[in-house]
Amino acid sequence: MMTGTIETTGNISAEKGGSIILQCHLSSTTAQVTQVNWEQQDQLLAICNADLGWHISPSFKDRVAPGPGLGLTLQSLTVNDTGEYFCIYHTYPDGTYTGRIFLEVLESSVAEHGARFQIP
């Protein structure tokens, strides 16, 4: 039975040209995290495998930095980066857990972080 929950940074906003950290945290399970995949709608941003290291998709290589930890730093933000991001935790023996983050990239300097929330 899958007992874990993913805690994410929830709905976040950031300024155009700035950077943002996408972060998820898996709790309430003793399952071993073997890999975390980061995706944006229909494309892969990055994979962090505990043993094989990081894979950064070529379309994001210039502006995605691994970390901190299992998270991902997205740099040089554009309005086109607005949308849903997913962290997919591959675990043993539970299977996969998915968290969702919605990022809004704003033209103005008024960019506030949303509240943290949980997805079962």
Partner: antibody, heavy 119, light 107 residues
Framework: QVQLVQSGAEVKKPGASVKVSCKAS????????MHWVRQAPGQRLEWMGG????????RNNQKFKGRVTITRDTSASTAYMELSSLRSEDTAVYYC????????????WGQGTLVTVSS | DIQMTQSPSSLSASVGDRVTITCKAS??????VVWYQQKPGKAPKLLIY???YRYTGVPSRFSGSGSGTDFTLTISSLQPEDFATYYC?????????FGQGTKVEIK
Amino acid sequence: QVQLVQSGAEVKKPGASVKVSCKASGYTFTENTMHWVRQAPGQRLEWMGGINPNQGGNRNNQKFKGRVTITRDTSASTAYMELSSLRSEDTAVYYCARSGLRDYAMDYWGQGTLVTVSS
Amino acid sequence: DIQMTQSPSSLSASVGDRVTITCKASQHVSTAVVWYQQKPGKAPKLLIYSPSYRYTGVPSRFSGSGSGTDFTLTISSLQPEDFATYYCQQHYSTPWTFGQGTKVEIK
């Protein structure tokens, strides 16, 4: 230029073990993950596992149920794959392959090592 | 494990033909797909990755596309040196898995 040079062909009896080496040159050995892929006659390629030469962490294909051990000697820029409890269906060409820096695509491959398991 | 299924398993074509090979994953693999070319007795060579980027030195007649579960490798105008076996591979999750291969033969 990047080169991966593997050890020579081996003939083994069922139940024995084989250890294949892969000597890397032309790049910084500890920066790229090394993988082992095998191909039985007329069959598809099969990923056996990979090792991060920097910290030694490795991920193996559970299909092999602990029969595969992947190691490395950073001072010799060499990766090793040992397969134990050999059976006839392990007869295959075994390749080492390097994946790119922060990229999982396997961009350079060794020449292959034929391992024949026969009584 | 994720299964990768290629079609067709083999095809016969002439020099100058447009050739399309498809690869279907048994579950979502996003864009974590790579294509390799292999000639008899030789190691595979990286062709296309992620899944539409040509590897260094690969001719522009090779192209790749797809996302999710369905992927395509296209050779726009087949050349004599392109007769080989082509494999797709996913690295979305371990164990990494390959398709069964598509052998491109001379008609």
